[in-house]
Interface confidence: low
């Protein structure tokens, strides 16, 4: 079976800097190399307005949803039809394709699945899902997200969002 | 060496129902979908169906489509083909297979489905 | 259905190629395999399966490429023994697919 992990699934990241999602995976079936593909799709909330706005009827909605299921990710957790899907690259042995969206920008996999962005830009906010196929092994968790939010620097907003963490916390 | 041994095949009567077994040996099985294949006599290769490796995934040809099962038992390394109401045009050569893009063949069990 | 050639010949120690084209996509890919039958009613060998890669115990005449959506079986030094019916397979997303075989003659 495939096992597909993003070790760090948030990111802020300032407008024009370069950023990497990482991701791994496992695999029990070695003998050839996966397609790792990147997709991304738009936030299904906006991500930037909300943390601007804490006490909103939307925000204090959500917070309920999530008291009743703690997994539940409002921004992340809605139907493809109601929001921008895009296949960003994919990687088959050495060969990286760009998605046509993409094609221009200096985006690459590197390693064995991870994305890099050597400068972001404004639209690149959302959730980049990292998937993992081989024909030869159909079986297991191949798919696992990051979320990446771009922030421009303005007076006006902070570098990093209220309650948005830019990795992983260690207790 | 990938080994892949059928049977249950033989003389069928038409609504009538086979199960053919797979067994398989020499490979890591529950890393591998397993499919099965039939040729009718004189013709080419159709697909009838497949399972994934943990056996959460089935799927069918249209021509089996509500008359097949597959399933496997990945402690015994083996999979099963249950086919009910059969007919006529369900005669031929059950080949046992391994991968989603076939890479191992199994020698075949002969069915023939006549009064 | 996969579409390859009804059959192809050619002489000892020539080229042969072999294609086929109307797989399925799998997250954008297309994959193929090549399977030799000898004779109707005896088991089938894979001669090449995702693409290109080939069995150990096949011989390296035997290889397999991709371009686009068609796959091609290429036979460098085709030996009498190579003559029988080969198919293609691939897949969609809900069922497994054969070409109806190419008779190659030698």
């Known amino acids: 079976a495939i096992q597909v992990t993003v070790p760090d699934p948030y990111h802020v990241v300032i407008l024009f800097q370069p950023v990497t999602l990482h991701c791994t995976y496992q695999m029990s079936n070695t003998l050839t190399a996966p397609i790792v593909i990147w997709k991304y799709k738009s936030f299904c909330r906006d991500r930037v307005a909300d943390a601007f706005s804490p006490a909103s009827v939307d925000n204090q909605l959500n917070a309920q949803l999530a008291a009743g299921n703690p997994g539940y990710n409002p921004y992340v957790e809605c139907q493809d039809s109601v929001r921008t899907v895009r296949v960003v690259a994919t990687k088959q042995g050495n060969a990286v394709t760009l998605g046509d969206y993409y094609q221009g920008r200096r985006i690459t996999i590197t390693g064995n699945a991870d994305l890099t962005f050597e400068q972001t830009a404004w639209g690149d906010s959302g959730v980049y899902y990292c998937s993992v196929v081989s024909a030869q092994d159909l079986d297991g968790n191949n798919e696992a997200y990051a979320e990446l939010i771009v922030l421009g620097r303005t007076s006006e907003a902070p570098e990093l969002l209220p309650g948005f963490r830019a990795g992983p916390l260690e207790d | 060496a990938v080994t892949l041994d059928e049977s249950g095949g033989g003389l069928q009567t038409p609504g009538g129902a086979l199960s053919l077994v797979c067994e398989a040996s020499?490979?890591?099985?529950?890393?591998?979908?397993m499919q099965w294949v039939r040729q009718a006599p004189g013709k080419g290769l159709e697909w009838v169906a497949g399972?994934?490796?943990?056996?959460?995934?089935?799927r069918y040809g249209s021509a089996v489509q509500g008359r097949a099962t597959i399933s496997r038992d990945n402690g015994q390394s083996t999979v099963r083909l249950q086919l009910n109401n059969l007919r006529a045009e369900d005669t031929g050569t059950y080949y046992c297979a391994r991968g989603s893009l076939i890479d191992a063949w199994g020698h075949g069990t002969e069915v023939i489905v006549s009064t | 259905a996969l579409t390859q050639p009804a059959s192809v010949s050619a002489n000892p120690g020539e080229t042969v190629k072999i294609t086929c084209s109307g797989g399925?996509?799998?997250?954008?890919?297309?994959?193929y395999s090549w399977h030799q039958q000898k004779s109707p009613g005896s088991a089938p060998v894979t001669v090449i399966?995702?693409?290109?890669q080939r069995p150990s115990d096949i011989p390296s005449r035997f290889s397999g490429s991709k371009s686009g959506s068609t796959a091609t079986l290429t036979i460098t030094g085709v030996q009498a023994e190579d003559e029988a019916v080969y198919f293609c397979g691939s897949y969609d997303s809900s069922a497994g697919l054969f070409g109806a075989g190419t008779t190659l003659t030698v």
């Open positions: 020499g490979f890591d099985f529950s890393s591998h979908e």
């Open positions: 399966y995702e693409n290109n």
């Open positions: 399972i994934s490796g943990a056996g959460s995934s089935t």
């Open positions: 399925g996509s799998y997250y954008g890919s297309y994959y």
